[in-house]
């Protein structure tokens, strides 16, 4: 999504279909307050950003309220009146769902059902990753609602779990971002634990989209 008109790199993140964040990195203009102008409809006049992000005292991005909009964002980054980067992008291609909240665990013998509050929009995958101290890497299971049952767990082992949400690639495209992970919680024999004892340093979980 970068694009490099006059050496300007941009990044777009559409947080939870609520707020669009457009940030730029323009080494040529590093000490300049670039301005951000945008519209959601190709026929409208441009509005100027009212909520800038600052880095070292200079503009580096803009936050826009854009609740549940399946729109194209037309925007122009300018140095005074001179456009240094102009583009249009479908906002939903850069969706980042919010982190799962209210994660709940229901145990039944060697299985656990993990639930959380479903987000208000669809075409998402809810991924649970889990591991015991004896596992060399994280196991993963995902469903299209936040109701994921994992079977075949060893009742005597302590397991760490966390959950995230991903946008379906066939709906939103390949450039979305997974949500941040939920808190890690540790469980043994259906009881919560502060940590899983003798846990080796966990390998980094698979972060593939």
């Amino acid at each position: 999504q970068g694009g490099a008109a006059e050496g300007v790199q941009i990044q777009i993140i559409y947080f939870n279909l609520e707020t669009v964040q457009v940030t730029w990195n323009a080494s040529k203009y590093s000490r300049t307050n670039l301005t951000f102008h945008y519209r959601f409809n190709g026929d409208e006049a441009y509005d100027q950003c009212t909520n800038y992000l600052l880095q070292e005292g200079h503009t580096s991005g803009c936050l826009l309220d854009a609740e549940q909009r399946d729109d194209i964002l037309y925007f122009s980054i300018r140095n005074g009146t001179h456009p240094v980067f102009t583009a249009s992008r479908w906002m939903v291609y850069y969706l980042k769902p919010s982190s799962p909240k209210h994660v709940r665990f229901s145990w039944h013998q060697d299985a656990v059902t993990v639930t959380c509050s479903d987000l208000s929009y669809g075409d998402l995958l809810y991924e649970v990753q889990y591991r015991s101290p004896f596992d060399t890497e994280w196991q993963s299971k995902q469903e299209n609602t936040c109701n994921v049952t994992i079977e075949g767990l060893d009742a005597e082992k302590c397991y760490s779990f966390w959950v995230r949400v991903k946008a379906m690639e066939d709906v939103y495209g390949p450039d979305t971002y997974p949500s941040d992970w939920s808190e890690v919680t540790c469980w043994q024999r259906g009881e919560i634990r502060d940590a899983c004892a003798e846990t080796p340093t966990p390998p980094k979980p698979k972060l593939s989209k």
Epitope: F15, N16, E18, T19, S98, S99, K101, H102, R104, F105, S106, W107, S117, D180, E183, I192
Partner: antibody
Framework: QVTLKESGPGILKPSQTLSLTCSFS??????????VGWIRQPSGKGLEWLAH???????YYNPSLKSQLTISKDTSRNQVFLKITSVDTADTATYYC?????????????WGQGTSVTVSS | DIVMTQAASSLSASLGDRVTISCRAS??????LNWYQQKPDGTVKLLIY???RLHSGVPSRFSGSGSGTDYSLTIRNLEQEDIATYFC?????????FGGGTKLEIK
């Protein structure tokens, strides 16, 4: 030291909008996993959970009041706000804000002292 | 909504007693049950979360237990400072709901 303090108008009339502020210190609402919520208690009665806002601006509302409630935050000023539109005498209560930290399974570990709100014509 | 019922709206006990306060949920809440103490001046404190986990700084004379729909808070060696109203709260499903409270009084 974690502290929360609620403030509000004290008295307002039916059909007006109630605006409450929770000012807190000792923690940041930008910390991952952190949340702040509102609970109310009519005099001599039980507690009713109203709304909750999270570090990433996710919001939860009690469905029975959702159409009346708006929760918001100003992370830099360590404040959380609750608006209740079209209040009635049934909204007369003490309003508390409370913190939900990481690791307590959605329990609220610190509460403010409460602010009393009376709705009367 | 899940209804939380505290059958006893008040209890009286003597200092030094062991007191048990019960709470029942209208459906299985998988131990997602918290206990709060409200002093007469309105101050609210978390005592126990997730059925039995003692919040930091809470005296060890407080303990919690239960599963499914039935839960209890036990206070051993009741002290004067424990005179308060105790509320249970389920956080298993939204909306989070509270019991009606049990007021603890000295005999």
């Amino acid at each position: 030291q974690v502290t929360l303090k609620e403030s509000g108008p004290g008295i307002l009339k039916p059909s007006q909008t109630l605006s409450l502020t929770c000012s807190f210190s000792g923690f940041s609402l930008s910390t991952s996993g952190m949340g702040v919520g509102w609970i109310r208690q009519p005099s001599g009665k039980g507690l009713e959970w109203l709304a909750h806002i999270w570090w990433d601006d996710d919001k939860y509302y009690n469905p029975s009041l959702k159409s009346q409630l708006t929760i918001s935050k100003d992370t830099s000023r360590n404040q959380v706000f609750l608006k209740i539109t079209s209040v009635d005498t049934a909204d007369t209560a003490t309003y508390y804000c409370s913190r939900r930290p990481r690791g307590t399974m959605d329990a609220m570990d610190y509460w403010g002292q409460g602010t009393s709100v009376t709705v009367s014509s | 909504d899940i209804v939380m019922t505290q059958a006893a709206s008040s209890l009286s006990a003597s200092l030094g007693d062991r007191v048990t306060i019960s709470c029942r949920a209208s459906q299985d809440i998988s131990k997602y049950l918290n206990w709060y103490q409200q002093k007469p001046d309105g101050t609210v404190k978390l005592l126990i979360y997730y059925t039995s986990r003692l919040h930091s700084g809470v005296p060890s004379r407080f303990s919690g237990s239960g599963s499914g729909t039935d839960y209890s808070l036990t206070i051993r060696n009741l002290e004067q400072e424990d005179i308060a109203t105790y509320f249970c709260q389920q956080v298993y499903t939204l909306p989070w709901t509270f019991g009606g409270g049990t007021k603890l009084e000295i005999k």
